[in-house]
């Protein structure tokens, strides 16, 4: 969490923004929030990138100006127009790229004043882990799967019942490059499990972090999965 | 209350065929994998063969692969098991018996039926 102050004359607006991650090949935000302002035409948005000449994207007198906006936005920005009144200035980036790394500054002027914030936006992929029971090992095994990571992550097995147990030994883990040749796909099979013991498969990078966990009993076999961001707020 | 009635068993001679049935009741039959086991009197339960819920995917113990085939009715709530070339040594009381997985390792089953004998000689 950003907060930045900007002084014009004797008025300053405080500018917030929140520190973001994109999934590559998707679409994302950069979330930015500003003091209120009902006079739409008064208010002006711009997004720049760090290193980037030009704009990332500019909104003012109610509607887009990307006049100066740089090329490798192009047609890829829009602003939530219908609820910039309300203060909110975030940025929709259309399909995500590596490239798209780095320091955004979200800079607001309106009726009241001036102020920008900076915030940090991270990209690469992550996914929401699968677990299944493996039929193909000799032994009672279970198969994690997520199909879109990067950067390469650790991926790490536990267990209620062993609690603090070291699985590596017990489990193998591949990493398979996806089409695009940026993403890989995670596989990962735990052998030996028994039943009435919740597994979970925990698979993590610099950005987020992924856990599935499954349970096998006698009458059926449920599943949970949750996927985190990291160093965001 | 799981209810599982094994069926169709009997004496044939060493070469023979049989068909046995299985009728369960008490639960939601295509939520289980579907399991065959059979124990020879006096010794410890054998897997057999097993079924996945919508009857794409079976596997089989070595010694009976190519001889023995499961099959199921999901509208009948019933799961069976083709024998072909029947062995003496394939003599055991066959039980089916269901789990959430296709993992077969007897302690885990908790239901059981009353079995049906099949006794191979000549």
């Known amino acids: 969490l950003i907060i930045g102050f900007g002084i014009s004359g004797k008025h300053f607006i405080t500018v917030t923004t929140f520190t973001s991650a994109g999934n590559i090949g998707e679409d994302g935000t950069l979330s930015c929030t500003f003091e209120p302002d009902i006079k739409l035409n008064g208010i002006v948005i711009q997004w720049l990138k760090e290193g980037i000449k030009g704009l990332v994207h500019e909104f003012k007198e109610g509607k887009d100006d990307l006049s100066q906006q740089h090329e490798m936005f192009r047609g890829r920005t829009a602003v939530f127009a219908d609820q910039v009144v309300v203060g909110n200035a975030s940025l929709r980036l259309k399909n995500v790229q590596l490239t798209d790394a780095g320091t955004y500054t979200c800079y607001i002027r309106t009726s009241k004043g001036k102020g920008n914030a900076n915030l940090e936006y991270k990209t690469g992929a992550f996914s929401m882990p699968e677990i299944n029971v493996d039929y193909n090992a000799s032994s009672e095994s279970l198969r994690c799967e997520a199909p879109r990571w990067f950067p390469q992550p650790t991926v790490a097995w536990a267990s209620q019942v062993d609690q603090g147990a070291n699985f590596s030994e017990v489990s193998n883990t591949s990493f398979e490059l996806n089409s695009e040749n940026v993403t890989m796909k995670v596989v990962s099979v735990l052998y030996n499990v028994t039943i009435n013991n919740t597994y979970s498969c925990m698979i993590e990078n610099d950005i987020a972090k992924a856990t599935g966990d499954i349970k096998v009993t006698d009458s059926e076999v449920k599943r949970r999965s949750q996927l985190q961001l990291l160093n965001s707020g | 209350e799981v209810q599982l009635v094994e069926s169709g068993g009997g004496l044939v001679q060493p070469g023979g065929s049989l068909r046995l049935s299985c009728a369960a009741s008490?639960?939601?039959?295509?939520?289980?994998?579907m399991h065959w086991v059979r124990q020879v009197p006096g010794k410890g339960r054998e897997w057999v063969s097993r079924?996945?819920?919508?009857?794409?995917?079976?596997s089989y113990e070595d010694s009976v692969k190519g001889r023995f085939t499961i099959s199921r009715d999901n509208a009948k709530n019933t799961v069976y098991l083709q024998m072909h070339g029947l062995r003496a040594e394939d003599t055991a009381v066959y039980y089916c018996?269901?789990?959430?997985?296709?993992?077969?390792?007897?302690?885990?089953?908790?239901?059981w039926g009353q079995g049906t004998l099949v006794t191979v000689s000549s």
């Open positions: 079924i996945s819920p919508d009857g794409s995917s079976t």
């Open positions: 018996t269901r789990f959430s997985t296709g993992w077969h390792r007897i302690e885990y089953f908790q239901h």
């Open positions: 008490g639960f939601t039959f295509t939520d289980f994998w």
